[in-house]
Interface confidence: medium
């Protein structure tokens, strides 16, 4: 048993042009957390299998609003490591998903929006008890860089934490500084001591004595990095202390390979020699697979059967994004019928319907008249969600219970008297004029 | 292997309760979405509460608020569902499922749903 470490370092845009400032915005604050994914190393069910070794969740980051025209400040990171506890042997050999999510925290109905800003995938080689492994993947415009490491739970011990060392309650027979390990009581267990003077950020051993480097480092200590240890470099003036040529600017300075791909020069440029799981001109694009199961919501994963080759997720209705992790904005498609307003809740889609109208859409147009009386012989008229009455004459209002005057409207033309009826009006005309409302 | 197993139901009379488990092996459901489904018979299957890995956040169907309530226990690797003033209208084989997505967003659908128990029968007698 183990607990497998990651801390992440950075996550930000990457290098070069067409990097995104920042994943948040002034309009819109957010917040990053991150998803680690375990799998065993290269054993074929593995793939199929979520997250076998173990998953781990961190915390949220801080809340960040991007300020506008001010420099993009390395981004608020979560706190702390996430932690993948293992409880049977660490396999050595295994594989990795981390991915960065994005929390919205804008004035969304219903709560916060989700989406995944990132994925990287590997394979990596990792013995338990080893030093801190460093890596930088990249995965489009974002850049995220962490250390990893897996460690054994006492009294597990070893590069697999498969072997049990527990203290006996006899006098041990073993030397200073030895402990005594089960199950053999003459078996004495050494700490693991590297060679004296060997890195402690840069080398390992696996063997007492050794002193092996991570990559990008080299000498009998780890002490130097790889860039500057050649005295063979045809190129630069000479250094005065050393003697070698100090290397100048060269295509292969720095690595530009990302992902742990090595980089050779060209006559013209330089070019990356990719692990498996990743490809691009830098090895800049991650592998993951069908078999990682990047589609959410119940998204179809089409190609991408082998690292090597891109997979495209095609969503279900509702949702987009490459992963199909966003959700479509339902109300867009103004599924709320008769002036409705619609609320996307997140769970459900709810519609607010205008008077006169009902059901999930408002596609239900209630009858207005229903159980609406017109007073004194008035008729009612249907329309946009409320009654209206057709009054008869001699009355007005909403529901006619009003007395009108006839007169009121002036409405005997060209200068005739209007005069009240019981049956309505009548209008006595000037000399020259006829008609009923004198208009002739 | 992935595997969830839902333990719990029965028969059960009108106005009792029930406390549904699913316990999952093969993977953590602390950083999967987790959710209860039931289908009657004859009727599709329909989602009835959900709780979120992202936000914490849980979710409950209208026609079960304030009797059902969905829980999770992350170090034991379970998800509950406590029922209380269980109705016959309830009665149903009951599911949970999990899903990589932080949210319980898409109108309750299954298909969003990666990993499904084979689910437990909840029978409730007049």
């Known amino acids: 048993a183990g607990v497998f470490e990651l801390q992440i370092h950075s996550f930000g845009p990457g290098p070069g042009p067409g990097a995104p400032r920042s994943p948040c915005s002034a309009r819109l604050p957010c917040r990053l957390f991150f998803r680690v994914c375990l799998k065993p190393g290269l054993s074929e069910e593995a793939a199929e299998s979520p997250c076998a070794l173990g998953a781990a969740l961190s915390a949220r980051g801080p809340v960040y609003t991007e300020q506008p025209g001010a420099p993009a400040p390395d981004l608020p990171l979560p706190d702390g490591l996430l932690q993948v506890p293992f409880r049977d042997a660490w396999p050595g050999t295994f594989s990795f998903i981390i991915e960065t999510w994005r929390e919205e925290l804008g004035d969304q109905i219903g709560g916060p929006a989700w989406s995944l800003l990132a994925r990287v995938a590997g394979r990596r080689r990792l013995a338990a008890g080893g030093p801190w492994a460093r890596d930088i993947q990249r995965a489009g415009a974002w850049e995220l860089r962490f250390s990893y490491r897996a460690r054994c739970e006492p009294p597990a011990v070893g590069t697999a934490c498969t072997r049990l060392c527990r203290p006996r309650s006899a006098p041990s027979r073993c030397g200073p500084g030895l402990r005594p390990c089960a199950p053999l009581e003459d078996e004495c267990e050494a700490p693991l001591v590297c060679r004296a003077g060997c890195s402690p950020e840069h080398g390992f051993c696996e063997q007492p004595g050794e002193c092996r480097c991570l990559e990008g480092w080299t000498g009998p200590l780890c002490t130097v990095p790889v860039s500057t240890s050649s005295c063979l470099s045809p190129r630069g003036p000479s250094s005065a202390t050393t003697g070698c040529l100090v290397p100048g600017p060269g295509p292969c300075d720095g690595n530009p390979c990302a992902n742990g791909g090595s980089c050779s020069e060209t006559p013209r440029s330089f070019e990356c020699t990719c692990p498996r799981g990743f490809y691009g001109l830098r090895c800049e694009v991650s592998g993951v697979t069908c078999a990682d199961g990047p589609c959410f919501n119940g998204g179809l994963c089409v190609g991408g059967a082998d690292p090597d080759s891109a997979y495209i997720c095609h969503c279900p209705p509702g949702f987009q994004g490459s992963n199909c992790e966003k959700r479509v904005d339902r109300c867009s498609l103004q599924p709320c019928r008769n002036g409705g307003l619609c609320l996307d809740l997140g769970h459900a889609l709810r519609c607010r319907c205008r008077a006169g109208f009902a059901g999930p859409r408002c596609e239900h147009d209630l009858d207005d008249c229903a159980g609406r009386a017109c007073a004194n012989g008035g008729t009612c008229v249907e329309g946009g969600g409320a009654h209206r009455c057709s009054c008869a004459l001699g009355f007005g209002g909403r529901d006619c219970r009003e007395r009108a005057d006839p007169c009121a409207a002036r409405p005997c033309a060209h200068g005739g008297r209007c005069y009240a009826h019981f049956s309505g009006l009548v209008c006595a005309c000037a000399p020259g004029y006829m008609g009923a409302r004198c208009e002739f | 292997e992935v595997q969830l197993a839902e333990s719990g139901g029965g028969l059960v009379q009108a106005g009792g309760s029930l406390r549904l488990s699913c316990t999952a092996s093969?993977?953590?459901?602390?950083?999967?979405?987790m959710g209860w489904f039931r289908q009657a018979p004859g009727k599709e299957r329909e989602g009835i509460s959900c709780t979120s890995w992202a936000g914490g956040r849980t979710y409950t169907a209208d026609s079960v608020k304030g009797r059902f309530t969905i829980s999770r226990d992350n170090a034991k690797n379970t998800l509950y569902l406590q029922m209380n003033s269980l109705k016959p209208e309830d009665t149903a084989m009951y599911y949970c499922?999990?899903?990589?997505?932080?949210?319980?967003?898409?109108?309750?659908?299954?298909?969003?749903?990666?990993?499904w128990g084979q689910g437990t029968q909840v029978t409730v007698s007049s």
């Open positions: 499922a999990a899903k990589a997505h932080p949210d319980c967003s898409g109108d309750w659908s299954p298909s969003g749903y990666e990993y």
């Open positions: 093969g993977f953590t459901i602390a950083v999967y979405t």
